[in-house]
């Protein structure tokens, strides 16, 4: 039984970025017609995960999956049964809380981003990792890079693959 | 700052399996001198993740990261500060709770495995996904495959890369 997929292209890109797999990232970005500047921006984020090693991927994967499966992402209409989920009640929309976390990761301050993650009862080690990644992204990415990343995210959210 | 890594080769293999990345899996298995039958066994598990789609990776990634960051895997010695973690208080041992979960995934019944996952306050949708993956693995893998997977896990746990 295939389970409901919530904006699969988003998670494809996220996991490609977090796993440091450049080939997989390129393939995913091609699917959403990413421009060169958008690709460059995503690769800068990917570099941060690579530099911080495997534990960084595990811990940030925890952040993403915790938020994705939190109460915030399980609204009234989707809190029913697993049967409903199989029937794709979730639709293919990205969860608003995930969208917000990604938005803050790019546009917020490190304190704002860490505080957002902390709301999901994340362990200190997870929060520290979130701050390290956020600081790395802020150091590597220009304002233009961040705008390109946001424009790519818009493409992802509105893609038929979402 | 690089963060402490707990048996990184285990998580390398897990994420390669869960992400359906055969090349990455081959690379990781080469590092621990996996035999051909061991590789075959791991690829059968990988097939289950691929067949169940992206959401399966997200949800099972949640199981793994939830257990890995649970109280069971954060003994007294490592629950102190992020500084302690940076000093690698965690060691490089695989957490017993993770080991048990993987063991049950291969040798237990679907009910036993799901019950184990349920102890980590997993959502119904996560539990359903765990059952689907477990049923798939039981259907695909022979007893010999499972023995090969277990012998590979022993290699991973005792590897200098762990």
């Amino acid at each position: 039984v295939k389970m409901a997929e919530t904006c699969p292209i988003f998670y494809d890109v996220f996991f490609a970025v977090a796993n440091g797999n450049e080939l997989l990232l390129d393939l995913s970005l091609t699917k959403v017609n990413a421009t060169e500047p958008e690709r460059t921006a995503m690769k800068k984020i990917q570099d941060c995960y690579v530099e911080n090693g495997l534990i960084s991927r595990v811990l940030d994967g925890l952040v993403m999956t915790t938020i994705s499966s939190s109460k915030d992402c399980m609204g009234e209409a989707v809190q029913n049964t697993v049967e409903d989920l199989k029937l794709n009640t979730l639709g293919r929309e990205i969860c608003p809380a995930v969208k917000r976390g990604v938005d803050l990761f790019l546009t917020g301050t490190p304190d704002e981003y860490v505080e957002q993650v902390a709301q999901y009862k994340a362990l200190p080690v997870v929060l520290e990792n979130a701050r390290i990644l956020k600081n790395c992204v802020d150091a590597k990415m220009t304002e233009e890079d961040k705008e390109n990343a946001l424009s790519l995210l818009d493409k992802i959210y509105t893609s038929p693959l979402c | 700052v690089k963060m402490a890594e707990t048996c990184p080769i285990f998580y390398d293999v897990f994420f390669a399996v869960a992400n359906g990345n055969e090349l990455l899996l081959d690379l990781s298995l080469t590092k621990v001198n996996a035999t051909e039958p061991e590789r075959t066994a791991m690829k059968k598990i990988q097939d289950c993740y691929v067949e169940n789609g992206l959401i399966s990776r997200v949800l099972d990634g949640l199981v793994m990261t939830t257990i890995s960051s649970s109280k069971d895997c954060m003994g007294e010695a490592v629950q102190n500060t992020v500084e302690d973690l940076k000093l690698n208080t965690l060691g490089r041992e695989i957490c017993p709770a993770v080991k048990r979960g993987v063991d049950l995934f291969l040798t237990g019944t679907p009910d036993e495995y799901v019950e184990q996952v349920a102890q980590y306050k997993a959502l119904p949708v996560v539990l359903e996904n765990a059952r689907i993956l477990k049923n798939c693995v039981d259907a695909k893998m022979t007893e010999e495959d499972k023995e090969n997977a277990l012998s590979l896990l022993d290699k991973i746990y005792t590897s200098p890369l762990c």
């Epitope: 919530t6 009234e76 209409a77 979730l90 293919r92 929309e93 608003p96 917020g108 505080e115 957002q116 | -």
Partner: antibody, heavy 120, light 107 residues
């Protein structure tokens, strides 16, 4: 020009039902989450419920949970609020509001409201 | 639920005055805070979102600041059109909550 027009308000007895509608125009309806916010006479604003672009995420205030149901019809650019078991404290002007960002959010455009009076 | 408390409840001011309204949250809302203006019989109008971002078309005399639990809305030179009730709203949670309102009236 963004326009939100509510309808369906009126006088209803306690325990009764009512269905409010909100007709949207001037923007791409499927790009936005939509909300209902109410305001009792002479009082402040109270959020009632929210629905995402494709109805995947529906959030309802505790005060109306189990009594109010939110839905949308993207083909008709319409938002609906089905209200059952109405109580005197549900008396208010009900505003339809668009979210300014498609995560739970602030409200960048509002309708003029429709008055619901629950009284015997 | 996150409680939002505005002060003062009523504020008497004259045209040209600098007016400051405070909004406190019962717990941190990070920077997820909006300010609205409402006139009698009308729908609220968005002024500021994300604590300090001015909505397009809103006069620059309106400004917002703060983060965490304490926020302020400032009107730098009150105009006749600014006499109204102002509400803050947190949207840190998926069930947003509003302050009780601050009425700015003619002194």
């Amino acid at each position: 020009e963004v326009q939100l027009v509510e309808s369906g308000g009126g006088l209803v007895r306690p325990g009764g039902s009512l269905r409010l509608s909100c007709a949207a125009s001037g923007f791409t309806f499927t790009s936005y989450a939509m909300n209902w916010v109410r305001q009792a006479p002479g009082k402040g604003l109270e959020w009632v419920s929210s629905i995402s672009s494709y109805s995947s995420y529906i959030y309802i205030a505790d005060s109306v949970k189990g009594r109010f149901t939110l839905s949308r019809d993207n083909a008709k650019n319409s938002l609906y609020l089905q209200m059952h078991s109405l109580r005197p404290e549900d008396t208010a002007v009900y505003f339809c509001a668009r979210e300014g960002y498609s995560a739970y959010s602030y409200f960048d455009f509002w309708g003029r409201g429709t008055l619901v009076t629950v009284s015997s | 639920d996150i409680q939002m408390t505005q002060s003062p409840s009523t504020l008497s001011a004259s045209v040209g005055d600098r007016v400051t309204i405070t909004c406190r949250a019962s717990q941190s809302v990070i920077s997820w805070l909006a300010w609205y203006q409402q006139k009698p019989g009308k729908a609220p109008k968005l002024l500021i979102h994300r604590a300090s971002s001015l909505e397009s078309g809103v006069p620059s005399r309106f400004s917002g600041s703060g983060s965490g639990t304490e926020f302020t809305l400032t009107i730098s030179g009150l105009q006749p059109d600014d006499f109204a009730t102002y509400y803050c709203q947190q949207y840190n949670t998926y069930f947003p909550t509003f302050g009780q309102g601050t009425k700015v009236e003619v002194k």
